[in-house]
């Protein structure tokens, strides 16, 4: 399908935006309010969205002050950007079992940005490992 | 597609005022961050005034030349940006364009409306 | 405020050859390896459209004869073969912070 793998590449480029805009967050932590975030770690499988738009929902915040403002209000603003939907993603919003995103661990903004990047990668990496095994799931 | 019209142009006198507005359509507009730019006649373009989207708490902010006496707001469930304008001057003649901020760039623009100031 | 310098402020450019349009800001608008600076075209009688964002990113749907490029305060805007309808108004712009400036705009003519 021409379609279908054009939508997986949008996918793919739209996860490294992702991870160089988290990058670029992570240079304005002190520009950040020090407010503690459910970042998810050790996501399980097939609970990679539901982390995804846990850290997508979080309400992470530019502390409002200097020369920096619009730059990280932008880059936050990109961050909950929808990225185009997978097979996987459309079978994992159906799933119910798991973690609410209130029960996972609260961590500051530069942990909270590290375990975003960290999630962003294993998603990357499922994609990349599951179209080189010829499907078309994730 | 995306569009954007601006209406409440006119003739005014030094002094008076004007609400301008901003009709929006074909994209997500309670999301977006929406800018007024302003152009006067044979000259350059000038940003006036943002509000930011409803995820932001709607927060505002404007030029030095338009402060105290311009304010900007939106009604996201109208889909429509406003741009309220007292104690005009006549340096504040110009076409005003409603813009859309979309990360990085006003991407799209209406084509703007008439706001001239004389006596 | 962050004050860009446009030059030439005017052109005049036979079909078919190239183009180069400068733009100075008086203070850095680039960190951390972006550049907050973009270039729009104003068309006679038209609103502005956006040619190149972020410094060098062509805007979906602008022909690839617009680059750009630069860091830092110098930032150039290039037209590699110029075409009849890409006479107008260039106008640089930065979003570094705020307020939000542009630059006087540079007047591109046809010979």
């Known amino acids: 399908h021409k379609s279908s793998s054009q939508g997986q590449d949008r996918h793919m480029i739209r996860m490294r935006q992702l991870i160089d805009i988290v990058d670029q967050l992570k240079n304005y932590v002190n520009d950040l309010v020090p407010e503690f975030l459910p970042a998810p770690e050790d996501v399980e499988t097939n609970c990679e969205w539901s982390a995804f738009s846990c850290f997508q929902k979080a309400q992470l915040k530019s502390a409002n002050t200097g020369n920096n403002e619009r730059i990280i209000n932008v880059s936050i603003k990109k961050l909950k950007r929808k990225p185009p939907s997978t097979n996987a993603g459309r079978r994992q919003k159906h799933r119910l079992t798991c973690p609410s995103c209130d029960s996972y661990e609260k961590k500051p903004p530069k942990e909270f940005l590290e375990r975003f990047k960290s999630l962003l990668q294993k998603m990357i990496h499922q994609h990349l490992s599951s179209r080189t095994h010829g499907s078309e799931d994730s | 597609e995306v569009q954007l019209v601006e209406s409440g142009g006119g003739l005014v006198q030094p002094g008076g005022s004007l609400r301008l507005s901003c009709a929006a359509s074909g994209f997500t507009f309670s999301d977006a961050w929406m800018d007024w730019v302003r152009q006067a006649p044979g000259k350059g373009l000038e940003w006036v005034a943002e509000i930011r989207s409803e995820a932001d708490n709607h927060p505002t902010y404007y030029a030095e030349s338009v402060k105290g006496r311009f304010t900007i707001s939106r009604d996201d469930s109208k889909n429509s940006l406003y741009l309220q304008m007292n104690s005009l001057k006549t340096e504040d003649t110009a076409v005003y364009y409603c813009t859309e901020y979309d990360y990085e760039g006003f991407v799209h623009w209406g084509q703007g409306t008439l706001v001239t100031v004389s006596s | 405020d962050i004050v860009m310098t446009q030059t030439p402020l005017s052109l005049s450019v036979t079909p078919g050859q190239p183009a180069s349009i400068s733009c100075r800001a008086s203070?850095?608008?680039?960190?951390?390896?972006?550049?907050?600076m973009h270039w729009y075209l104003q068309k006679p009688g038209q609103p502005p459209q956006l040619l190149i964002y972020l410094a060098s990113n062509l805007e979906s749907g602008v022909p690839d004869r617009f680059s750009g490029s630069g860091s830092g305060t110098d930032f150039t805007l290039k037209i590699s073969r110029v075409e009849a309808e890409d006479v107008g108004v260039y106008y640089c712009?930065?979003?570094?912070?705020?307020?939000?400036?542009f630059g006087q705009g540079t007047k591109l003519e046809i010979k």
């Open positions: 203070k850095s608008v680039s960190t951390y390896g972006y550049s907050y």
């Open positions: 712009q930065h979003s570094r912070e705020l307020p939000l400036t």
